[in-house]
């Protein structure tokens, strides 16, 4: 049956273009190293937004780049995407791989639809 990853169906990005959601996976109990990949699906195309590997026992920030930040706690991962614009609206899929030790497991979430609404520009004031 494979491992499943659970994530919310819908998230609304903030006015600053930031969206966060939790990705939770079914733990096999002995995974020490877990790789999390954020994928964006547009039509039939799937593109990688960001990815990182973390050590389960560390329970700390494992991902911090210009696009994503991530913190882990056990079998839950809190993912934040920043810099989103209206064009970034789409389905964001959480992929979790239990990398070490064997056995290898992979779980794909059903995706989180992130809605991004660009703020209206402020009218010029005289």
């Amino acid at each position: 049956k494979g491992m499943h990853a659970a994530q919310p169906a819908v998230v609304l990005a903030s006015s600053r273009g930031v969206a966060s959601f939790v990705c939770e996976y079914g733990s096999s109990g002995n995974a020490a190293e877990v790789r999390v990949t954020m994928l964006r699906q547009a039509g039939s195309q799937m593109t990688e937004v960001c990815a990182a590997t973390y050590t389960v026992e560390d329970e700390l920030a494992f991902l911090d780049d210009s696009t994503c930040t991530g913190t882990s706690s056990g079998n839950k991962v809190n993912l934040t995407i920043q810099g989103l614009r209206a064009m970034g609206t789409g389905l964001y899929i959480c992929k979790v791989e239990l990398m070490y030790p064997p056995p290898y497991y992979v779980g794909m979430g059903n995706g989180t639809q992130i809605y991004v609404i660009d703020p209206e520009p402020c009218p010029d004031s005289d």
Partner: antibody, heavy 114, light 108 residues
């Protein structure tokens, strides 16, 4: 472009030693535990063993336990396979691969013969 | 010890659909991966986690797993699909990864 390049394969006599290297590029090597897999001539694939991303933990198949050692140097993006007490049955193409087998090298040939 | 059993060879005409089975003698709960090995080349992952296809792998390749049998399906065989195909999973008895014996696919 992701690349794994194995080197060090050679013809060696039974009882001899050899060290294989696998240099990675095009991905964050330190994020990936690594495996070594071998394939005897005209035969199937067999796992040799693996190492975690930090290099602190390893595992081996029974056929090589006590003879082979896997290590890595993340600063050099390299994983190693030290092979001692080599036997004729160790003759194979040796591949390195990421622990999820997503990426594979092109292999290096080890021949053990007197 | 669990063994992943595959047919030694299968053949199919160009454009046909072919399936390759991978049977384990235990009802393994573990994920199955499939690899394609073209003549003289290193293996390439074509299916991971039973049914997931890496980017770049043609959509004609698909995988499934039910009970103790995993299946690789190639819908609409192309000449370039002629290769050896290996399944791989995890075996508690050896506490490690095991590979099937491989299936040679011939395109007629």
């Amino acid at each position: 472009e992701v690349q794994l390049v194995e080197t060090g394969g050679d013809l060696v006599k039974p009882g001899g030693s050899l060290r294989l290297s696998c240099v990675a590029s095009g991905f964050t090597f330190s994020d990936y535990p690594m495996n070594w897999v071998r394939q005897a001539p005209e035969k199937g694939l067999q796992l040799v063993g693996g190492i975690n991303s930090g290099g602190s933990a390893t595992y081996y198949t029974d056929a090589v336990k006590g003879r082979f050692t896997i290590s890595r140097d993340n600063a050099k993006n390299t994983v190693y396979l030290q092979m001692n007490s080599l036997r004729a049955e160790d003759t194979a193409m040796y591949y390195c691969a990421t622990s999820n087998f997503q990426y594979w090298g092109q292999g290096t040939l080890v021949t053990v013969s007197s | 010890q669990a063994v992943l059993n595959q047919p030694a060879s299968v053949s199919a005409a160009l454009g046909q659909r072919v399936t390759i089975s991978c049977n384990t003698n235990i009802g393994s709960p573990y994920d199955v991966q499939w690899y394609q090995q073209l003549p003289g080349k290193s293996p390439k992952t074509i299916i991971y986690g039973n049914s997931n296809r890496p980017s770049g792998v043609p959509v004609r390749f698909s995988g499934s797993k039910s009970g103790s049998t995993a299946t690789l399906t190639i819908a609409g065989i192309q000449a370039e699909d002629e290769a050896d195909y290996y399944c791989q999973s995890y075996d508690d008895n050896v506490d490690g990864y095991v590979f099937g014996s491989g299936t040679q696919l011939t395109v007629l």
